[in-house]
Interface confidence: low
């Protein structure tokens, strides 16, 4: 029955959005009017009142009902008058949502639009502190970064003053994120003051003065390790050959190695003339696996380029009197070993293979007993999922979701009516082919505390907080380890590449350049992101979408952070924050049933709550479509 | 098409204040800086001061500082200039005018700080 | 501040002819400068801005050059509605200033 009078509902609002131009709630032809207390943009947790005034011809209106996200709303709906009705929020969490209200008219079967509005919810601005900017050598661009502080959810402006010492010459530019300043652009001198102003409805807030000198912020142009061959002396060594494009005469370089299978790092420093290739002598254990990293700033100056790419070399067994090997990179720019998953082997001995293969063939079996007890006994596989996740090894359901085979996918692909066209926040591209995922970590400059001799653990060491970014674009999605973390934009390093082979090239990153709270120490990763709104499914009836997820996610119970596993799907690129209590806003994508379980598998998160975008009516106009064949 | 619409010609006493409004149509009013120029009578154009709607960045000249105000409301694309301690000389032509569009460059909009819309001018007449 | 000169003051001309304006400045604006035209009773209109970029919808006939402190503005063929006044104005220092303008009349 409850089934019956979510359709119902459902039913009714599809009549009410054919009744609106195909434009989101901004195009309403309104028989009335809805209006928000404070205001529809207002600051997270607030208490709100939304009310509706109608207006319709000939129609004294029996009852008026609130609709949110296309969802009847049936608490808190306090009748005024004989037209105006007021809906109380108390402590308000949505990002975002969509708000009409209807009238129900005697002698009328169905319901009468009267409006609709678009709410807000967020916070002001911070400070924006750590404001950076550095100039990549050969780049042409000062590139300007800062840390803009806590979310914020709602849409955050920064405008960045370039103030010249010498001619007094101010510049401002607008932007979502970082900046690029072409360095032509900066006729004043060399002598600058840097500020940023970030902005949104709620507040505005203005960071320190940063004082440049243009020729102390240059980074020389990236250094390469480009072989290393282990030579047979009475000791034997092992010789890396290193360079870099650079013109900068005065260069100092750091050299850091470790064995693959070590978490600290050993650093070399060295002063160096780039004028020709450099040669670095170390002296290792035989037949171990090393990893090396360079890295140079100019002379005395403050700021360091990333760690170049990882670059590995084996030493060997019994020394022949000369080993050559220029061993690949792995990766771009990264600090962490890399864990490089590709559609060939695992670059790991035999035992791993069979390990990784034993693993599988035991997850494939369990998996099928799952399945069995899921189609049979509801409650019992609610109970017994999460003894088997403690069992089983956690890369076995960890980073990389499968919707093969899920009914909701299934669905959405038969009705494409259900996607909406025109929105870039509901994009459907099922089972992507993984060919590998990379974690690394985008370093800055040399932080103050920084010893010759690094000998603390690989993740606390030589990630400064402060990256600097440049115009690739790329998008967050949750995390398994973190809880949740919404879709932002974010850059990369100018001084970072992707690698010279094919393997990321498939990679075309093209979301919008739009909005930007950058974290701190990201990492970036190629992940699986299914970035279909599942709130908007969520709505037609709990049966459709929460029994398509029984398996993971029983209604009545809460379950670990990987029922998210079968919420995302799309090779996407991102970076991520380490801090679990970090969490980057601007899209959920987790209905509100997900998300309380997931405040209480993670305390340490602030609250999290389903984001609706803007279009969500539109998207629920098309779904309701459905219902009607 | 973008349109800046002023309040109407005001008549005022030395001594008094004066608030012109200019409100925007027609294109993102919280992204482009907002200047105010005023013209004498025959005489050529003055800039007074300018503001970033969005940012609530205002800029005057020296000559108007702390007689001058500018302001922004987002909520209606309304920019407002308010001249106070007004005198026979302040008897002009007030013009609200927005910065040059197109600036955006990449990720950003360069505040220009050269203007492409004007509204229609509101006479301020100062007399006693 | 930084001072704009216009000169000449006033240039009579006839419509087909070329016309030159010169702006000055009293230091280097680099070369954010900008071109105005006013007709009596309207808003100025922006023609050309960072020295030499014609701004929408102005005719290919007039053109802005210079840098420094010399900035010239060319109408290379008067027409009938190109008899007004014309500005100068600088970006590259607070305040913005403007020349006093330069009156084009027809002969």
């Known amino acids: 029955m409850n089934q019956v009078t979510i359709q119902w509902d459902a039913v009714i609002a599809l009549y009410i959005l054919f009744s609106w131009c195909h434009g989101g709630i901004t195009n309403i032809n309104c028989s009335g009017h809805i209006w928000v207390e404070p205001a529809t943009i207002f600051k997270m947790g607030m208490n709100i009142s939304i009310y509706c005034q109608a207006a319709i011809k000939n129609c004294q209106p029996r009852k008026l009902h609130f609709y949110k996200n296309g969802i009847k709303e049936r608490f808190q709906i306090t009748r005024i008058n004989k037209t105006t009705a007021r809906l109380w929020y108390k402590n308000f969490l949505e990002p975002h949502a969509s708000m009409y209200c209807t009238a129900e008219c005697p002698k009328h079967f169905q319901e009468t639009l009267i409006c609709g509005k678009d709410i807000s919810s967020g916070y002001p601005p911070d400070i924006p502190d750590e404001v950076t900017c550095v100039i990549y050598e050969y780049s042409g661009n000062m590139t300007c970064t800062w840390n803009a502080g806590k979310l914020t959810y709602i849409d955050t402006k920064y405008v960045v003053h370039v103030k010249s010492l010498e001619t007094e010459e101010e510049q401002q530019y607008l932007t979502s994120s970082y900046i690029n300043i072409s360095t032509d652009s900066l006729q004043g001198g060399k002598k600058y003051l840097v500020w940023v102003q970030a902005a949104n409805a709620l507040g505005m807030e203005e960071s320190k003065q940063l004082q440049i000198h243009l020729d102390d912020i240059v980074i020389p142009s990236a250094a390469v390790i480009s072989r290393a061959e282990t030579i047979n002396a009475t000791v034997p060594k092992t010789i890396i050959y290193w360079d870099s494009q650079t013109t900068i005469e005065k260069v100092s370089c750091e050299m850091r190695y470790k064995a693959t299978t070590n978490q600290t790092w050993n650093v070399k420093e060295f002063d160096t003339n780039f004028t020709y290739v450099q040669q670095s002598e170390f002296y290792l254990e035989p037949n171990i696996k090393y990893v090396f990293q360079v890295r140079c700033q100019e002379t005395g100056k403050r700021y360091w380029q990333p760690w170049s790419s990882l670059f590995f070399h084996k030493t060997p067994e019994t020394v022949p009197q000369v080993t050559s090997k220029a061993f690949q990179h792995d990766t771009w720019n990264s600090g962490l070993t890399v864990a490089s998953i590709s559609t060939g082997h695992l670059t790991s001995d035999n035992r791993g293979d069979i390990g990784l293969l034993l693993g599988m063939i035991v997850f494939a079996v369990m998996l099928s007993i799952l399945s069995l007890i899921g189609i049979f006994n509801r409650s019992f596989r609610t109970g017994i999922k999460r003894r088997i996740l403690l069992l089983i090894p956690k890369w076995l359901y960890e980073d990389i979701p499968n919707m093969k085979n899920s009914n909701v996918v299934k669905m959405l692909q038969e009705n494409s009516e259900l996607m909406n066209n025109n929105s870039s926040e509901q994009v459907l591209y099922v089972d992507p082919m993984i060919t590998e995922i990379k974690e690394i970590f985008i370093p800055e400059h040399k932080p103050t505390d920084y010893k010759k001799e690094n000998t603390g653990p690989l993740e606390t060491r030589d990630y400064p907080q402060n990256s600097l970014f440049d115009n690739t674009t790329v998008v967050y999605i949750p995390d398994l380890n973190t809880g949740y973390k919404p879709q932002i934009s974010n850059f990369l390093p100018e001084g970072s590449h992707l690698s010279n082979n094919n393997e990321i090239t498939s990679l075309t990153l093209k979301p919008p350049v739009d909005s930007l709270d950058s974290g701190n120490n990201p990492r970036l990763q190629k992940h699986p992101n299914f970035a279909f709104s599942v709130s908007s499914v969520n709505s037609l009836s709990n049966t459709i979408f929460l029994g398509e997820l029984s398996l993971i996610l029983n209604q009545g119970e809460c379950s670990s952070p990987d029922i998210q596993n079968s919420v995302e799907e799309e090779t996407t690129m991102l970076l991520e924050n380490d801090s679990p209590s970090e969490t980057i806003p601007e899209q959920t994508l987790l209905p509100d049933e997900f998300v309380s379980c997931l405040g209480i598998v993670n305390e340490e998160l602030p609250s999290i709550n389903t984001y609706f975008p803007q279009n969500i009516l539109e998207s629920h106009f098309n779904r309701i479509s459905l219902l009607e064949k | 098409q973008v349109q800046l619409v002023q309040s109407g010609a005001e008549v005022k006493k030395p001594g008094s204040s004066v608030k012109v409004s200019c409100k925007a149509s027609?294109?993102?009013?919280?992204?482009?800086?907002i200047s105010w120029v005023r013209q004498a009578p025959g005489q050529g154009l003055e800039w007074m001061g300018g503001?970033?709607?969005?940012?609530?960045?205002?800029n005057y000249a020296q000559k108007f500082q702390g007689r001058v105000t500018i302001t922004a409301d987002e909520s209606t694309s309304t920019a407002y200039m308010e001249l106070s301690s007004l005198r026979s000389e302040d008897t002009a032509v007030y013009y609200c005018?927005?910065?040059?569009?197109?600036?955006?460059?990449?990720?950003?909009?360069?505040?220009?700080?050269?203007?492409?819309?004007w509204g229609q001018g509101t006479l301020v007449t100062v007399s006693s | 501040e930084i001072v704009l000169t216009q000169s000449p003051a006033t240039l009579s001309l006839s419509p087909g002819e070329r016309a030159t304006l010169s702006c000055r400045a009293s230091?280097?604006?680099?070369?954010?400068l900008a071109w105005y035209q006013q007709k009596p009773g309207q808003a100025p209109r922006l023609l050309i801005y960072?020295?030499?970029n014609r701004a929408t919808g102005i005719p290919a006939r007039f053109s802005g050059s210079g840098s420094g402190t010399d900035f010239t503005l060319t109408i290379s063929s008067l027409e009938p509605e190109d008899f007004a006044v014309y500005y100068c104005?600088?970006?590259?220092?607070?305040?913005?200033?403007f020349g006093q303008g330069t009156k084009v009349e027809i002969k």
């Open positions: 005018a927005r910065d040059l569009s197109g600036g955006y460059l990449g990720l950003r909009t360069l505040y220009y700080y050269y203007f492409d819309y």
């Open positions: 503001i970033i709607p969005i940012s609530g960045y205002a």
């Open positions: 027609g294109g993102t009013f919280d992204s482009y800086a």
């Open positions: 104005q600088q970006r590259s220092n607070w305040p913005l200033t």
């Open positions: 960072d020295a030499s």
């Open positions: 230091q280097s604006v680099s070369s954010y």
